[in-house]
């Protein structure tokens, strides 16, 4: 299709080389059309649409994204060619930063239902650069935490080194929806609730003598509870002896509850202890079996191919640790009688 009629938008993504970071492009179809798709209509009823209404569908995934190769080749379907780019409804998610993401991205409706729809498309020219500004060493992270029940703020990473006074007007989105009341480089939250969690996007306009473009940053906001003050507790095994059958395989499970920690480095290990020595056993990786806001339950199993007499002389010790401290639970195997 002819993309010469598409509206054009220029965006800049300046990524930090020292942190993981995502980016998004919204399918900014002309205003009336957009409402049929992504429900992010910014028009008030009094505003007059620039284009005739697009007779679109209400299916939120009815948008097709393409990339325009720089060599003039035909448009490429994003879903087929770029595994690190994911389409979610009307939003294109870039999972990894890198200058190779630079290029022209085009979105348009999948279904063309009227003659007016042919030009219903948007071309986004994305420039991606690594951050070089060393003066702003403490720029806001692209992952920010809000403590539930307290006051907090979400800072726009690309503007966090500027004072509120010199900051340009910022457009904020949360999970793809416009936050019309927010215009500064920082969103202040009077009391944090779990619904404040999500993907926030901050945009501001930068210009030079030739053109203007939108500078965009994406912030993943997580609502958290305060760090635990407790060491982990072992939920299983509870008993310090376990009845077993000789010659049969055996799995002993260690389940431990770890309280929330912002920097979470849980340790869960199995040791064997006999009369002379203690050593760590090579066992399958630990797995999280339940995760809530306040805590996480992690399980790690020790597997014996078959229980031998030797195993009855040993203690099997589960060791768990967080930043506060550690807990152990030992199990002695006992032969089942009868």
């Amino acid at each position: 299709f002819n993309i010469s009629g598409c509206s054009t938008k220029k965006l800049l993504w300046t990524y930090s080389t020292r942190s993981e970071e995502e980016f998004v492009l919204f399918c900014d179809l002309p205003e009336p059309q957009k409402s049929h798709f992504c429900h992010r209509n910014r028009l008030s009823p009094k505003q007059v649409p620039e284009h005739l209404p697009f007779m679109g569908s209400n299916d939120l995934s009815d948008v097709q994204w393409y990339q325009q190769p720089s060599n003039g080749d035909p448009l490429e379907d994003i879903r087929k060619s770029y595994p690190h780019i994911i389409q979610d409804k009307c939003t294109l998610h870039f999972l990894t930063p890198g200058v190779n993401n630079s290029g022209s991205y085009i979105c348009r409706p999948k279904m063309i239902k009227s003659p007016y729809d042919v030009a219903c498309c948007v071309k986004m020219i994305l420039e991606v650069k690594p951050q070089t500004n060393a003066s702003c060493e403490y720029s806001a992270s692209h992952k920010q935490d809000l403590l539930l029940g307290s006051t907090g703020s979400i800072s726009c990473p690309s503007l966090s080194c500027q004072s509120d006074a010199q900051s340009p007007a910022v457009t904020w989105y949360k999970n793809g929806k416009l936050l019309s009341v927010e215009r500064s480089n920082r969103i202040v939250v009077d009391e944090v609730y779990d619904y404040h969690q999500g993907t926030y996007v901050c945009d501001y306009t930068q210009s030079d003598t030739v053109s203007s473009w939108t500078v965009r940053a994406v912030v993943q906001v997580r609502t958290i509870v305060g760090d635990t003050k407790l060491k982990p507790d072992i939920l299983d095994p509870v008993e310090d002896t376990l009845e077993v059958e000789l010659g049969k395989p055996l799995t002993i499970s260690c389940k431990a509850r770890f309280g929330f920690e912002r920097v979470f480095n849980p340790v869960i290990k199995w040791y064997i202890k006999d009369s002379d020595l203690e050593w760590e056993v090579s066992v399958p990786e630990a797995k999280s079996i339940k995760s809530t806001l306040k805590d996480e339950i992690i399980e790690r199993n020790i597997i014996l191919e078959k229980v031998t007499q030797r195993d009855l002389r040993r203690k099997f010790v589960c060791f768990v640790q967080n930043s506060i401290g550690n807990t152990t639970q030992s199990v002695q195997l006992k032969e089942k009688r009868g």
Epitope: Y271, I272, D274, S275, D276, L277, E278, W279, E280, V281, S282, T308, Q309, R310, R313
Partner: antibody, heavy 115, light 109 residues
């Protein structure tokens, strides 16, 4: 790989430390064992250090030897050598973190205790 | 005290022949037994562990068998390169049973 060093001629009573340097695996995964062999004699187990850093010794070796480790080395200290300690000292990796068969072995280092 | 007795102390056989080395434990060691080969001036090399499992890269001419207190290493189709001293080792239960047999010298004629 595993390689011993530090073997030399010492006089009786002079403490000596042998070092086993490992590469290609982690001492937090595997146990390390010291074995010695007097000239023309069989293999004699001295002691073990587990992946967690715990140690155990043959009954005859207790008090005469001390095993310790860093992230890439395992030391064997002969506290008060006697002429009976003249031997080639081998360090070997266990197949697991505790008691197990030994593989691979280092080439050995010769200790001669003589006045 | 736990003992691991290896017999014979020396054995001689012709090229292409078979030798059998025995290792007797003073108590049941539940197959926690290894066999090593040592050539003059070299460190021991693991041949077999868990009584019968061949170590990586070892020829299938070496065969370990046995259970309880009696274990055997059989070397078939002897070659000149098999001339060495062979040791059994128990790793059953702690320091008491972590020990080597006295060794068997194999001479190939």
């Amino acid at each position: 790989s595993v390689e011993e060093s530090g073997g030399r001629l010492v006089t009786p009573g002079t403490p000596l430390t042998l070092t086993c340097t490992v590469s290609g695996f982690s001492l937090t995964t595997y146990a390390m064992t010291w074995v010695r062999q007097a000239p023309g004699k069989g293999l004699e187990w001295i002691g073990i250090i587990s992946n967690s850093g715990a140690t155990a010794y043959a009954s005859w070796a207790k008090g005469r030897f001390t095993i310790s480790k860093t992230s890439t080395t395992v030391d064997l200290k002969i506290t008060t050598p006697t002429t009976e300690d003249t031997a080639t000292y081998f360090c070997a990796r266990g197949r697991s973190g505790g008691w197990d068969a030994l593989d691979p072995w280092g080439p050995g280092t010769l200790v001669t205790v003589s006045s | 005290a736990f003992e691991l007795t290896q017999t014979p102390s020396s054995v001689s056989a012709a090229v292409g022949g078979t030798v059998t080395i025995n290792c007797q434990a003073s108590e049941d060691i539940e197959n926690y037994l290894a066999w090593y080969q040592q050539k003059p001036g070299q460190p021991p090399k693991l041949l077999i562990y868990s009584a019968s499992t061949l170590a990586s890269g070892v020829s299938s001419r070496f065969k370990g068998s046995g259970s309880g207190t009696e274990y055997t290493l059989t070397i078939s189709d002897l070659g000149c390169a098999d001339a060495a001293t062979y040791y059994c080792q128990s790793y059953y239960d702690g320091a008491v049973t972590f020990t080597f047999g006295g060794g068997t010298e194999v001479v190939v004629k």
